[in-house]
Each structure stands twice: as C-alpha cells, then as structure tokens.
C-alpha cells in the first residue's frame, strides 16, 4: 500500500488537520492540570499523575497506553534532620544557618511535599572547614586557582556559582580538586535580569530562591546501581559503593541571600579578574577562609539525605503505523518535577498531551500514520535520566532495529524570544522546511514564517539566511536514543535572547516559584509559543512519521563533518612541534570526510529517481537513511565513557548540557601540554583520529548501493 | 503471598543485647521498605528503625540511634536488629513491617507507609 492508501487523506491535509486540531487553550488548561501539587519522581503524586495521563492518552484514542515501572535509586532529604549550612565560631557554636527551606510562592502556603532544596544524591556528612570561591567550578576556573594563583582546595568547602555548566560537573571538578564540600548558589549575575521584579512580581529568582538538582556524573549509564541493564524485578544491583557516578563529598544548594552571608566574610587572595564578580556586595575573595575579624571561623555542613531504590513509572502510548509499524518515530518528554513544574518539566508535558490529542482525533476520524508514534510520559528524569534509560536499556533491541527518530519534549520555553532547536544534522531540512510553514508568534512578524524570525533573532554564524541549529549535548530524556543507542534525534523550544541576557537557564529553574502562575502571567499569557512549539515538535513527528521518504538529508550530515574535522586539526596545529614528531596525520579522516560527501551526494540523487511505487526498494532506502545515525555508533564507547557511543558527538567532559563534535579527538587533545608521557597522550590522539577515520568511512558506506 | 515472620525475642537486663529477625516469604521483591515498629503497653505503635531493601539505606528514630543496627541480607531475605545499651522504655511488642514497591513514603518510619505486618515478637528489659 502506498500512504495515501493507508491513511485515506492526501498527507497535505493530514498535517494540517492535524496542526490545526492544535489549541492554545487546551495548553493552557494541561498546564494548570499538571502544576497544582508537586510531583517529585518516586512519590505517590507523581504515580497517580502518571495513572492519570495513561487514562487520557487512552480516551483521546491511542491504540494501547502502558505504565512501564522500574526500581531505581532516588534521593531524598531526611524528613527529621534537615540538610543546612552554618558558620561556627572557635567555640564551634552555629552563629549563622542558611534557610531550610523558600518561602511559599502566594497561594501555596498549604501545599504539603514541597521538597526542600537540596543536591540529589550528595553523600551524608558534617564536613567543617575553610571556604575557598572557585566561581563557577568549571575545569578553565580550578586551572586559574591551582596553576596560576597557586590556591590548594584540599580538605577546604569550596562555593561555587551555579551557571555555564551542569553542576554535576562543578562537584566532579571540586572532587578532583581535593574539595570535602560544595556549596551551589545562585548569584544574581546569573539569575536575576536587570530591570525584572522578583517573583511573584516578576520573572527572576528572590533571594530566597534555590535551585535544586541531581550532581550525579552518569555518562549516561541511567540507574547507578544497574549499569546497562534495566532496573526491573529480577534486576541484580550494585552494592552502593559500586554504584555509577555518585558524588563522594557532600554538597548542598543555597540561595543569594544566605550566599550573601558566606562569602562577605571570605578573606584570602581577591578574585583574579572582573569574570570571577557577580553582582552581589561581596568582594568575590577567593580565600582560603574568612578575612581578619572572622578568621577563627569556618563553615560546617550539615547533609542527611539518603540514597533509596524507589520504584518509578514511565508512561508508554502507541499509535500503530498503517504501513511500516515496525518503524518507531518517538515523542518523549518527562513528567517528574522537583516541586510544581510550572516550565520544567509541564510546559513540555502539556504540550506532548495536545499532540497526542490532537493525533488521537485524526485516528478517530480513520486516519492513520505510516509509522508507529510511541508517545512517552518520562519518569526521574530530574535524578539522571533515569525512566528515559531505563526503558530503552530494556527495549534497546527493539529500538535499534526500528527506530527512526526520537523527539524531545521537555520544557517548551525558557524564554519568549525565538525559538531554539538542537538536532541531528539528518534533520536540519526537515527543520527548515517545516519553519518555513508554519505563523511566527513574535511581535513584529505579523503574517511571516517562523523560519523567518527565527532567522533574524537566531542568524546561523555559517550560513547567511539561515537559522542556527545547535549540536546536541545531553542534560535531558533525547541522551540514551541519541548517544547510547544511534536514533536520530531533535529537540525544540523558545528561548531568551542569549545577547540581552547573559544569566544561565531561567532564573527561576527548579525553585518552588515555577509555578503556573509564573507561565501565564510573565512568560507566555497568551500560550502562543507554546502553541508554536507543539507545532514544531508535533510537526516534525507527523512528517518523521508519514513522509513516504524519510525527511533526512544525509548531505548535511557531509558538512558539518567537514567543519568538525576543520575545526579539531585546528586545535591540533595548535602544537605543530609535537604533531611533527609524533607523526600525527589527519589525512584519514579528511580522506574519509570527503569519500562521505561524494557518496551522500549520490544518495541524495538516487532518492530522487527511485520508483517510490516499488515497496522493497522505498523500505531500502528508507532503512539506508534511517541506519546511518546507527553507523555513528562504536559498541566500545567512548574512553571511560562506554554508554557514550556516538563518535561524532557526545556531552562535553566539561559540561554535560553542551555537545562537542569528534569528542574522542577532543578530549585526547585536551590540556595535552600537561601530560606526563607526551609520547603515550600523543599515540591517543592518533588512536582516535583512526577510530573517526574509520567511523566515517564504515557510515558512509552505508550509503553505497548496496550491491 | 507475602509473609513476614519475626523470631528472636526475649527477656534481659538493662544494659543487655538482643537479635531480632524478620524473614520474608513470598514475593519478596515487592518490597522496598521492610523495618521494625514497636508498642509498649498503653502507648501508640511508634517506628524504630526501617532500611531501603534496593540499597540499604536507613532511619532510625531518635531513641534509638546509635544503640539499635538495622541490617538486610538480600540472599536470605532477612532483616535483622542488633539492639544493644537497652533500656526499660525500649520494652514492647516488636513488629516487622513490609512496604510494597508503589510509591515512596513521605516519610519511611511512618507506620501508615506500611501495609504487611509480621505478628510481633516481645521484648522485655527489666531493671
């Protein structure tokens, strides 16, 4: 059967009944729906929240909606003994204590399980000692601090800024450095706008506020204690000491206020530059310790919390495909929160549910797509991506034999000013065209395409006329389909004007004051980007899904590679000496770049000539398209990094949230001038520039005819 | 179906140590909360040490800490309490108690988070 057979409507009109069914209101309403109590994974709120989308997404018509559990390790504060921070006095006697908690936001004074803030799965411990500012945390920061300012961190509490990197590695560089504490805090540089009120006045973090967060290094390897497995009944599990990617110093999260009371004690060196200040009256000193008057004081840390195996549930939905269902495209989004949720994670959750309901319409009224939809309500997302990994570790050989794509679906903004995308480069014409289609919601672009003020906001820095698109990092749900497993994937929402506003996130992230409230009456009143961003998203699952050909250009996957060899033998010239003596060679991988670039090339000509009338021949082609992401991935891994498989991309070792291209050249390199055996780092780099090589090539012979 | 069956209690002096077990029957791993409850003539059934089954995490009460160990030996499926430095005020009924796996407790020592319950073992602490 040919698609328009399967589906009994022109697949023109199937994409615009289906973006037309597509409501604000309806939005708007989910939203309200999901963010009146907390829903922190592992509790029985977020269990009933997710037995009551199973009861909707069945109503709104999908074939089967599951709940698929697993038992995975949580964390959790101790009810009893609250997590604090204090300032003793020689006598050892607390003379000041941070907050135990943020202040209600108005009209939620009586909600029960608001969660206090804390750093999920920081070890127990009372650690006492000399504070030392180490800015942000970030590797470039402990360089500054141990090589160039000759500042030790051993057996010292180190306070860092939240902000420019995921703060698991922030705790990973403090670890390495010797620190026996963390303290994350929010500054207002980066948390507070200049000319915004504070919440529920306005957009930006109260003092009071405080960001929590999971500071766990997983490199993707899902529950710590099941590593590559599913965390199911039969599971075998780790002892804790064993377990993956836990902290081994306590660490806790404070807000600006109680910050404040921290570091305009501190003493020692002064910052090492106007980078190392943010915007409270403090003096930025670095330390070691209090200053003068203060200098018998220290810092105690007071952590409770426990590790607990907790079972959670992930929601599964099924749309059967009319004519390929063993082929999956994906839509995923996670539907724990740390308290109300109000963007992370419902504004994408609301979302998810308009799509599903409005594909639950056009089933109803006989339509169908060509592929199957999966439609996934994530669970323990905010703990380390936990539901989202477990369940592909358990459906891993179902989805590497027929998944086609995988889309994203956590918050839907973080700002209101364009919209942002980070995909695969397979789906960058697919992104482009779709934008192309589609109302821009922004003031000033009355009547235009959203391509176009997309464009203008967010001009790609290569390509005049064109939209930026980012590389995918990890931080959220899309990690084991896109890194682990090879599924080409994408993620959409709107942002803030990263040249205007330079604080990190959303000022509010993961405070209590994420609230509904927040969302309609300061970020989106009218719901009209969120109502663009189901478009996208919903757009881009409905063409994955019913396009006859796979929407994927395997020729922009060409080019990029192309720029990413450019742009790690730069980095490599960067010591010409040492390349010359060691005989390092990028030939291989330019050689194999540009065979990759004449065979995608002939692809992309074939595609256009081939009888699409002709089953066997369209599914072959389609399955060339859909395996090459698959031919990125190396089942060894990446060094000390096994679940990151994809050799193109992976998070950064230096920031989980952002992507880099050739990581296993890149980290090679890395601060290779600092190696104690040359010879030995520079045999590494040359052993990964052959496994790039080799990838590229072995990816782009995917893409002969096959015979 | 799921059983709880403790064994090991007794009479002794203050100052003494007793051993209870709990074992568990049944499927066992539905469990994620096993812990100890106890009720002391005229008084309320209070929480005295409960441990995460997955990873062995613990709470104990207050009273108790540091004189009472709740341990787990996953292979047996058994949890023990080592309760040493007694006191009169620890003399009750001593009861092991199951959570299903569902959903967390909001607080793990509660007994409301407890839905099986073993029949109860006495333990007397005489002056």
């Known amino acids: 059967k040919s698609s328009n057979e399967a589906t009994n409507i022109t697949p023109k009109h199937n994409m615009k009944a289906f973006l037309d069914e597509l409501k604000a209101e309806n939005i708007k309403k989910f939203l309200y729906n999901f963010t009146q109590i907390p829903h922190l994974a592992g509790t029985e709120q977020n269990f009933q929240l997710a037995k009551q989308i199973q009861s909707q997404w069945k109503e709104f018509g999908l074939d089967s909606v599951e709940l698929a559990h697993y038992d995975v390790l949580l964390s959790y504060p101790n009810k009893t003994h609250p997590n604090y921070i204090s300032i003793i006095n020689e006598d050892g006697n607390e003379i000041f204590n941070t907050s135990l908690f943020e202040p209600p936001p108005p009209g939620y004074e009586n909600v029960s399980d608001i969660v206090p803030p804390f750093s999920a799965f920081s070890p127990q411990g009372m650690p006492e000692g000399d504070l030392v500012y180490v800015n942000y945390a970030r590797t470039e920061d402990f360089f500054k601090l141990e090589r160039d300012m000759k500042i030790n961190c051993s057996g010292k509490i180190v306070i860092a800024r939240y902000g420019k990197v995921f703060r698991g590695n922030k705790v990973k560089n403090a670890q390495l450095a010797g620190a026996k504490g963390v303290i994350l805090y929010s500054d207002p540089a980066d948390y507070f706008a200049p000319g915004v009120k504070s919440y529920p006045d306005g957009w930006n973090l109260p003092g009071g506020g405080v960001q929590r967060g999971n500071i766990l290094n997983l490199n993707g390897a899902g529950d710590p204690l099941t590593p590559g497995y599913p965390a199911n009944e039969y599971a075998y599990r780790r002892g804790i000491a064993e377990a993956v990617g836990l902290p081994s110093i306590p660490v806790h999260p404070i807000g600006y206020y109680d910050a404040q009371k921290l570091l305009e004690k501190m003493g020692g060196s002064a910052p090492p530059d106007s980078s190392w200040r943010g915007s409270l009256k403090v003096p930025y000193n670095v330390g070691p310790g209090f200053t003068g008057n203060f200098s018998t004081q220290k810092v105690k840390m007071h952590i409770h919390s426990t590790n607990e195996v907790t079972r959670i549930y992930n929601v599964i939905g099924t749309l059967r495909g009319a004519v390929e269902p063993d082929r999956y495209v994906i839509l995923g989004g996670h539907r724990d929160s740390w308290v109300f949720g109000g963007i992370d994670p419902q504004s994408g959750a609301a979302v998810v549910h308009e799509i599903v309901r409005s594909f639950g319409t056009l089933k109803k009224e006989g339509w169908r797509p060509r592929r199957t939809i999966l439609f996934a309500s994530w669970d323990a997302e905010e703990f380390g991506l936990l539901g989202s990994t477990e369940w592909a570790e358990e459906n891993s050989r179902l989805l590497q034999e027929r998944g086609v794509a995988y889309i994203n679906a956590d918050s839907s903004i973080e700002g209101n000013y364009t919209l942002r995308v980070d995909c695969t480069p397979l789906m960058y014409s697919l992104v482009h065209n779709l934008t192309k289609e589609l109302k821009s919601p922004d003031e000033g672009f009355e009547g235009k395409s959203l391509y176009e003020s997309w464009t203008k906001k967010s001009p790609s820095p290569e390509f005049s006329g064109m939209p930026r698109i980012s590389k995918l990092g990890s931080g959220n749900d899309f990690e084991v389909f896109f890194q682990r497993l090879g599924i080409a994937s994408g993620r959409a929402r709107y942002t803030k004007n990263w040249e205007t506003n330079k604080f990190s996130g959303y000022p509010l992230y993961h405070s209590v004051y994420e609230t509904y409230e927040l969302v309609e009456k300061f970020y989106d009143p009218m719901f009209k980007y969120h109502l663009t961003v189901a478009q996208v998203r919903g757009g881009m699952v409905f063409e994955l899904a019913n396009s006859i050909v796979l929407p994927f250009d395997c020729r922009d996957y060409a080019v990029v590679l192309r720029k990413y060899a450019d742009k790690i033998y730069s980095i490599s010239m960067k010591h010409p000496q040492e390349m010359k003596t060691y005989s390092v060679s990028f030939d291989s991988l330019f050689s194999a770049v540009k065979n990759f670039t004449e065979i995608a090339s002939k692809f992309s000509e074939r595609l256009q000539d081939f009888d699409k009338s002709n089953p066997i021949v369209l599914r072959m082609m389609n399955d060339q398209l859909m395996f090459l992401e698959r031919a990125f991935i190396d089942p060894l891994g990446l060094p000390d990094r096994p679940f990151y498989r994809h050799v193109i991309y992976a998070p950064s070792s230096h920031n989980k949230y952002a992507g880099e291209s050739f990581p296993g050249i890149y980290d090679a390199l890395f601060d290779i001038e600092s190696k104690v055996d040359p010879s030995k780092a520079w045999g590494e780099v040359k052993r990964q520039i052959y496994v790039a090589a080799f990838t590229v090539q072995a990816a782009a012979e995917t893409l002969s005819e096959v015979a | 179906q799921v059983q709880l069956q403790e064994s090991g209690g007794g009479s002794v002096q203050t100052g003494g140590s007793l051993r209870l077990s709990c074992a568990a029957s049944?499927?066992?791993?539905?469990f994620s909360w096993i812990g100890y409850f106890r009720q002391a003539p005229g008084k309320e059934r209070e929480g005295?040490?409960?441990?995460?089954?997955?990873?062995?995490?613990?709470y104990y009460a207050d009273s108790v800490k540091g004189r009472f160990t709740i341990s787990r030996d996953n292979t047996e499926n058994t949890i023990s309490l080592e309760m040493n430095s007694l006191k009169p005020e620890d003399t009750g009924l001593y009861y092991c108690a199951g959570s299903l796996r569902w959903s967390r407790p909001p607080n793990p020592i509660s007994e409301d988070a407890y839905n099986y319950w073993g029949q109860g073992t006495q333990v007397t602490v005489s002056s």
């Open positions: 005295v040490a409960v441990i995460n089954v997955g990873v062995g995490s613990t």
């Open positions: 049944g499927y066992t791993a539905s």
